[in-house]
């Protein structure tokens, strides 16, 4: 029950997080005109990953897309890439996690398969969240650098008279949305990974005890270990991680009707 709750909660938290990452990526307010200690202008500038906007005092807003690809700063391209990778990984993770949910039955899918899918989606969510946090942080760092550069260059001209007042930009709402969304996706991913451990078949720490008969030998082992019919010295005690998949050195091991999994 706790496993189902953890998995379900992880899914919901990740879903909210990914929705937030998508929203942040689409938002125009990644950077907004700094109004503190600046002359009051009749226009307000703000910029996103895809376009920049100018809002007039009248309320009229004009946005222009960045129609060039090569002319854009490399950092902006990197941020775009990180956010898109985050969205794609998150979307795939959501798709995988839907099928991995314990409360949803699909055919005769074993718990071990669901555990694997849960782990996969969890890892995807973690990477997705990290991509978003990295993207937003890179952009924030770029803003901070530019802010102090423009502050240093703010007052130029003869005899201290203000000739040019540079527009300085500060953190926009999208950055905070991105950080929170990335964090939620990360938390959701961790929860999925935790749920995966509970979904995996039960394991014990008891040592396996093998009984060797003179001829055909059958090894009986407690739960969590795979019983194998051994021939000569090829009898092995193997711990199951993959829900029944055999490793290469088990090629000569044949299951019998006495196997306990």
């Amino acid at each position: 029950m706790a496993v189902t709750a953890c998995q379900g909660l992880g899914f919901v938290v990740s879903l909210i997080g990914i929705a937030g990452i998508i929203a942040a990526t689409c938002m125009d307010q990644w950077s907004t005109q700094d109004l503190y200690n600046n002359p009051v202008t009749a226009v307000f500038n703000y910029q996103g990953l895809w376009r920049s906007c100018v809002r007039e005092s009248s309320g009229f807003t004009e946005c222009r897309g960045y129609f060039t690809l090569l002319g854009l700063p490399a950092m902006l391209q990197a941020v775009r890439a990180l956010m898109i990778v985050g969205i794609v990984l998150g979307a795939i993770g959501l798709l995988v996690s839907i099928f991995a949910l314990k409360c949803i039955r699909i055919g005769s899918m074993e718990d071990s398969a669901k555990a694997n899918m849960t782990l996969t989606s969890g890892i995807m969510f973690i990477v997705s969240g990290l991509c978003a946090i990295a993207g937003v942080s890179v952009f924030a760092n770029m803003l901070v650098t530019n802010f102090w550069m423009s502050t240093a260059n703010m007052y130029t001209g003869m005899g201290g008279m203000v000739q040019t007042v540079q527009t300085r930009y500060t953190f926009g709402a999208a950055l905070f949305v991105g950080w929170v969304a990335g964090g939620l996706t990360l938390i959701g991913g961790v929860m999925m990974c935790i749920a995966c451990r509970g979904l995996a078949p039960e394991e014990t720490n008891y040592k396996a005890v093998s009984y060797h008969a003179s001829g055909h030998s059958v090894a009986y082992k407690p739960g969590g270990f795979k019983a194998s019919t051994g021939f000569g010295s090829n009898t092995k005690n193997k711990k199951i991680y993959d829900g029944g998949a055999r490793t290469e050195d088990e090629v000569q091991s044949y299951p019998s009707k006495h196997d306990y999994v």
């Epitope: 005109q33 009749a42 500038n45 703000y46």
Partner: antibody
Framework: QVQLKESGPGLVAPSQSLSITCTVS????????VSWIRQPPGKGLEWLGV???????YYNSALKSRLSISKDNSKSQVFLKMNSLRTDDTAMYYC???????????WGQGSTLTVSS | DTVMTQSPSSLTVTAGEKVTMSCKSS????????????LTWYQQKPGQPPKLLIY???TRESGVPDRFTGSGSGRDFTLTISSVQVEDLAIYYC?????????FGAGTKVELK
């Protein structure tokens, strides 16, 4: 068609208060801003202030302490109030509509104010 | 406040002549967000309210004859009348439309010789 008409007292004694009303038609005060500009006799234009559709107002910094702009959207009226009038406040007072891009695209004919004892 | 300086204060011209007047701002009126210059030109004829001519430094208002041309960027702006007509005799004002408080220049008076 867009129209703006100013109506004021005409003559006011020094130290008294002034109230001029700008009645508009052909557009909504919730959508557009209205600015006030004055022009002393034989002199240039002086921007007094503006009130935007959302109700936020900006003023000429030299007159801010004695100036107030308000509006009544339902009556399509904008009000300019100025206190502690001096003789150098004698001027033609215009109200003008701000276009979406903020320039003054329509002007009233103006209201003459004389500050004299 | 942003100071707008217009020159010359008056011009005496003959009909058909090319007229150029200047407007200088104490601060740049160029907005980096959209690369537009927030400078507006108005024409005021005697006994009339001002009339909008040009906004964004170079965009003509609809109905304004194409003999009126606005140019310039940052702090220096120019209004040119390619072939002045009798009806163009008026006072021309430039306005800072970027920084609050919005400010007007003192005007350039165009008179007939």
């Amino acid at each position: 068609q867009v129209q703006l008409k100013e109506s004021g007292p005409g003559l006011v004694a020094p130290s008294q208060s002034l109230s001029i009303t700008c009645t508009v038609s052909g557009f909504s005060l919730t959508d557009y801003g209205v600015s006030w500009i004055r022009q002393p006799p034989g002199k240039g234009l002086e921007w007094l202030g503006v009130i935007w559709g959302g109700g936020n107002a900006y003023y000429n910094s030299a007159l801010k302490s004695r100036l107030s702009i308000s509006k009544d959207n339902s009556k399509s009226q904008v009000f300019l109030k100025m206190n502690s009038l001096r003789t150098d406040d004698t001027a033609m007072y215009y109200c003008a509509k701000n276009g979406l891009l903020r320039y003054l695209d329509y002007w009233g004919q103006g209201s003459t104010l004389t500050v004299s004892s | 406040d942003t100071v707008m300086t217009q020159s010359p204060s008056s011009l005496t011209v003959t009909a058909g002549e090319k007229v150029t007047m200047s407007c200088k701002s104490s601060q740049s009126l160029l907005n980096s967000g959209n690369q537009k210059n927030y400078l507006t030109w108005y024409q005021q004829k005697p006994g009339q309210p001002p009339k909008l001519l040009i906004y964004w430094a170079s965009t003509r208002e609809s109905g304004v004859p194409d003999r009126f041309t606005g140019s310039g960027s940052g702090r220096d702006f120019t209004l040119t009348i390619s072939s002045v007509q009798v009806e163009d005799l008026a006072i021309y004002y430039c306005q800072n439309d970027y920084y609050y408080p919005l400010t007007f220049g003192a005007g350039t008076k165009v008179e007939l010789k």
